[in-house]
């Protein structure tokens, strides 16, 4: 029997300060350039070394950004989302959704880290 892949979805508020290397990440997605099928959301595609996001450590590639400084990113064209970030100012508050893949083994299988009961 094969294992099943589940996802643990969590949300987090991340406050970043635009430093000398900027916020330091790239995005994909938007209503005109969907990154995920049937989802026009904005996703983190790259985190740059020495940028504010990398130094903070919480934002991850693949995270979905739900809002910037309280402004919802739903149903935005890609460029409009980019402009929102670029005009967000020095202190930037991000509401993000992390999607962690959880591998469940076959029924009856005890993983190495499981307590022996």
């Amino acid at each position: 029997m094969n294992g099943r892949v589940d996802y643990l979805v969590t949300e987090e508020e991340i406050n970043l300060t635009r430093g000398p290397s900027g916020l330091g990440f790239n995005i994909v997605g938007g209503t005109d350039q969907q990154y995920v099928s049937n989802d026009s959301g904005i996703y983190v595609s790259r985190i740059k070394e020495n940028g504010a996001a990398a130094l903070d450590g919480r934002l991850q590639e693949g995270d979905k950004i739900l809002s910037v400084n309280g402004q919802d990113l739903k149903n935005l064209l890609h460029q409009d989302a980019v402009d929102l970030f670029r005009n967000a100012g020095y202190a930037v508050s991000l509401r993000v959704q992390h999607r962690l893949q959880v591998q469940n083994g076959p029924i009856g299988h005890r993983g190495e880290g499981d307590p022996s009961g």
Epitope: R18, S21, G22, L23, G24, F25, N26, I27, V28, D32, Q33, Y35, S45, R46, K48, G51, L77, H78, Q79, V82, F85, R86
Partner: nanobody
Framework: HVQLVESGGGLVQAGGSLRLSCAAS????????MAWFRQSPGKERELVAD????????YYRDSVKGRFTISRDNAKNTVYLQMNGLKPEDTAVYYC?????????????????????WGQGTQVTVS
């Protein structure tokens, strides 16, 4: 395999014009924009102009504003750089580049690392 091929470079007198072209071939990519960079001897490669693939947004570095125009033809997978009023300081190798995402930072933070695919370059010399 994605390929970007530049053409249109050459030798021109100050005040003259050139039109650079960059043709993209290979697998269809969900590109977010294409750009022209330039590099002169002993200097870092610098972003000259960028156009979003949707065409709704363009950027120009200050020194070329009003003289250079970037445009794209999605049907032909080609990006152009029309360069008018050329100056000797525009002399450089010009590179076409494509990006598969967008930086969230203002343009002064954007650089070589934000672009994923590169052409081989075409020489522009202004005498």
């Amino acid at each position: 395999h994605v390929q970007l091929v530049e053409s249109g470079g050459g030798l021109v007198q100050a005040g003259g014009s050139l039109r650079l072209s960059c043709a993209a071939s290979g697998p269809s990519m969900n590109w977010y924009g294409m750009a022209w960079f330039r590099q002169s001897p002993g200097k870092e490669r610098e972003l000259v102009a960028d156009v979003s693939w949707s065409g709704g947004s363009t950027y120009y570095r200050d020194s070329v504003k009003g003289r250079f125009t970037i445009s794209r033809d999605n049907a032909k997978n080609t990006v152009y750089l029309q360069m008018n009023g050329l100056k000797p300081e525009d002399t450089a190798v010009y590179y076409c580049a494509a990006r598969t995402s967008s930086s969230v930072d203002p343009w002064n933070y954007v650089g070589v690392g934000d672009y994923d695919y590169w052409g081989q370059g075409t020489q522009v010399t202004v005498s």
